[in-house]
């Protein structure tokens, strides 16, 4: 898909930081999502995994931002081939993994 501009990526990173900072209560009531191969996948795959979570206001902005990075409409399960060994993880861990991945991309200058 199209490469998101650097500013949009930074805004997404900042939003993920807002969600996770000093947070110990389970995000989205401990909802589980598919663990994904972020390196092989990307924004659309991350959105696909989070699409399964509904009624969680904490990640609604993240879902909207990810959809802006994805060139086509994503439906749940669309990228099931990129799920990691059919493993599910908590939303909080998914967000932390995504955050680290996006920082790595940013530092490597892939979106500058």
């Amino acid at each position: 898909g199209p490469v998101p501009p650097s500013t949009a990526l930074r805004e997404l990173i900042e939003e993920l930081v807002n969600i996770t900072q000093n947070q110990k209560a389970p995000l989205c009531n401990g909802s589980m999502v598919w663990s994904i191969n972020l390196t092989a996948g990307g924004f659309c795959v991350a959105l696909d995994s989070l699409t399964n979570v509904s009624g969680c206001s904490a990640i609604e902005k993240t879902q909207r931002m990810l959809s802006g990075f994805c060139p086509h409409k994503v439906s749940a399960g669309q990228f099931s081939s990129l799920h990691v060994r059919d493993t599910k993880i908590e939303v909080a861990q998914f967000v932390k993994d995504l955050l680290l991945h996006l920082k790595k991309l940013f530092r490597e200058g892939q979106f500058n």
Epitope: Q21, N22, A25, D97, F106
Partner: antibody, heavy 126, light 109 residues
Framework: EVQLVESGGGLVKPGGSLRLSCAAS????????MSWVRQAPGKGLEWVGR??????????NYAAPVKGRFTISRDDSKNTLYLQMNSLKTEDTAVYYC?????????????????WGQGTTVTVSS | SYELTQPPSVSVSPGQTARITCSGD??????AYWYQQKSGQAPVLVIY???KRPSGIPERFSGSSSGTMATLTISGAQVEDEADYYC???????????FGGGTKLTVLG
């Protein structure tokens, strides 16, 4: 060795200004969130404010008593944190500490303010 | 503004267990951190994220949290543990830090 060294403290009259600096070494400063904390004579610790790393948005937050008077900034090229203090009041008299708020932030870890400087003393008096 | 409440003082005899509490409305969802400050020195982190101990901190220091209360426990307190202890956390937004008022731990020699 991770180290923070504050400087710039001194005696200033009420209404005056002062700029504190905090020189960092031994870690990747640009990755770290940095905080200022103060301690009035014989009193407890008081959080002053914090600045995130630029990659985390560079957001700055302040405690209510200093908002609008104090400004936190950073220069990642110089590994230095700053606290610009304007319209100083006698109640701002304190030892001011800088602290790393998130050395492991880039890796998704959070350790709290795990490294502190030795502090620099600010006295506001007429 | 958000507050964390600690007892002003706690006294124990050497070898006894000291418990210092910290209460705050956001503690069910935000982690607590504990700092030790000895006279004339900068604070030292002794517990982070409620229960974790940084390297170099003796095993007798431990932390726990339940509901709106976080607790620092020093099992077998020693004379060198005499210091001021502060809890730290953030408000519910996570954007503003706050310290408790501090607890003076006296280890009666």
């Amino acid at each position: 060795e991770v180290q923070l060294v504050e400087s710039g403290g001194g005696l200033v009259k009420p209404g005056g200004s002062l700029r504190l600096s905090c020189a960092a070494s031994g870690f990747t400063f640009s990755n770290a969130w940095m905080s200022w904390v103060r301690q009035a004579p014989g009193k407890g610790l008081e959080w002053v404010g914090r600045i995130r790393s630029k990659i985390d948005g560079g957001t700055i937050n302040y405690a209510a008593p200093v908002k609008g008077r104090f400004t936190i900034s950073r220069d990642d090229s110089k590994n230095t944190l700053y606290l610009q203090m304007n319209s100083l009041k006698t109640e701002d008299t304190a030892v001011y500490y800088c602290a790393t708020d998130q050395v492991g932030a880039y890796y998704g870890d959070y350790y709290g303010m795990d490294v502190w400087g030795q502090g620099t003393t600010v006295t506001v008096s007429s | 503004s958000y507050e964390l409440t600690q007892p002003p003082s706690v006294s124990v005899s050497p070898g006894q267990t000291a418990r210092i509490t910290c209460s705050g409305d956001a503690l069910p969802e935000k982690y607590a951190y504990w700092y030790q400050q000895k006279s004339g020195q900068a604070p030292v982190l002794v517990i982070y994220e409620d229960t974790k101990r940084p390297s170099g901190i003796p095993e007798r220091f431990s932390g726990s949290s339940s509901g709106t209360m976080a607790t620092l426990t020093i099992s077998g307190a020693q004379v060198e543990d005499e210091a001021d202890y502060y809890c730290y956390s953030t408000d519910s937004s996570g954007n503003h830090g706050v310290f408790g008022g501090g607890t003076k731990l006296t280890v009666l020699g």
